[in-house]
Amino acid sequence: MAVTACQGLGFVVSLIGIAGIIAATCMDQWSTQDLYNNPVTAVFNYQGLWRSCVRESSGFTECRGYFTLLGLPAMLQAVRALMIVGIVLGAIGLLVSIFALKCIRIGSMEDSAKANMTLTSGIMFIVSGLCAIAGVSVFANMLVTNFWMSTANMYTGMGGMVQTVQTRYTFGAALFVGWVAGGLTLIGGVMMCIACRGLAPEETNYKAVSYHASGHSVAYKPGGFKASTGFGSNTKNKKIYDGGARTEDEVQSYPSKHDYV
């Protein structure tokens, strides 16, 4: 029950996180015009990964896409790549985790396969979350660098006669959405990995094989020890030898509902 809850919660948290990563990637407010200690303008500038926008006092908002690819800063391209990789991994992770959910029955899929899928999706969520956090952090670092550079030469002009106020940019809402979303996806991934451990069948049974000797003495020989990790095929223990001896596994048994936590 606890495993199902952990897996389900991990899935929901990751789902919210990935939705947040998608939202952050699409948002226009990655950087917004710094209004503090600046001349008050009748226009408000803000920029996203894909376009820059200007909202005028009149209420009119004009957005322009970055139609060039080669002309864009390498850092912006890197952030775009990280966010897209995060979304793609997260989406695949979600798809895998849907089939891995313990509460969803798909044919005769064994728990070990579900454990595998849960771990895979968990790792994907972790990487997805890390990509988003990295992308947002790289952009934030770029902003901080540019902010102090533009503060250093706040006013530029010809001999101080004509002043051009440089527009400074600060953190936009998308950065906070991205950080939170990345964190949620990461937490969801960790929860899925924890759930995977509970899903894996712990077949730590000591197999015993008994055979009747031709004499009056009875020999007891311990069979092969198998600790199942839940990965790979769930192969049955082989017979040690055929001479009338039978392993316990040859009598086909399915795990009962009490076998796992």
Partner: antibody, heavy 120, light 113 residues
């Protein structure tokens, strides 16, 4: 047709108060940014205040800050300018203006104006 | 505050003449975000409110004759009337639409010779 009609002007003593009104019609009043601009007897144009459409943020000229208040009643399609502690330098013709939504913050419509005279 | 300086303060012209008036701002009115200039030109005839002629430094307001042309960028702007008509006799104001407080120039008065 867009129309802006100002009212409420008159003669007032220094330190007195006055409330100007601007009745708007012919457009979706609530979504437009509105301003008050005054023209002094010397024919100089001075921006007084602005109220942003939708958001309701307000901006004031330093000379009127703390004394004048711009507000709007979207239900009545009316813009107001509450003027307190009036001074002789506030004597002017007050225009109600609309900022065009595609006109780069320019004032595309102006009312005929209402006259305010501050004198003892 | 942004200072808007208009020159000349008055102009005497004959009908059909080409007229150019200047407006200079103390700070650039060019927005880096969209590369647009936030400057407007208004025409005011006696006894009337000002009328918008040009916005964004160079875009003609609808209904404005094409003899009116706005140009310039950053801090230096110009309004040109290619062939002055009798109905163009008025006072022309430029306005900073970029910074609060929104400021106007003192105006250029266009008179007949």
């Amino acid at each position: 047709e867009v129309m802006l009609v100002e009212s409420g002007g008159g003669l007032v003593k220094p330190g007195g108060s006055l409330k100007l009104s601007c009745a708007a019609s012919g457009f979706t009043f609530s979504s437009y940014t509105m301003s008050w601009v005054r023209q002094t007897p010397e024919k100089r144009l001075e921006w007084v205040a602005t109220i942003i459409g939708g958001y309701g943020n307000t901006y004031y000229a330093d000379s009127v800050k703390g004394r004048f208040t711009i507000s709007r009643d979207s239900a009545k399609n009316t813009l107001y300018l509450q003027m307190l502690s009036l001074r002789s330098e506030d004597t002017a013709l007050y225009y109600c203006t609309r900022l065009g939504q595609t006109q780069r913050n320019a004032m595309d419509y102006w009312g005929q104006g209402t006259s305010v005279t501050v004198s003892s | 505050d942004i200072l808007m300086t208009q020159s000349p303060s008055s102009l005497s012209v004959s009908a059909g003449e080409k007229v150019t008036m200047s407006c200079k701002s103390s700070q650039s009115l060019l927005n880096s975000g969209n590369q647009r200039n936030y400057l407007a030109w208004y025409q005011q005839k006696p006894g009337q409110p000002p009328k918008l002629l040009i916005y964004g430094a160079s875009t003609r307001e609808s209904g404005v004759p094409d003899r009116f042309t706005g140009s310039g960028s950053g801090t230096d702007f110009t309004l040109t009337i290619s062939s002055v008509q009798a109905e163009d006799l008025a006072v022309y104001y430029c306005q900073n639409d970029y910074y609060y407080p929104l400021t106007f120039g003192a105006g250029t008065k266009l008179e007949l010779k």
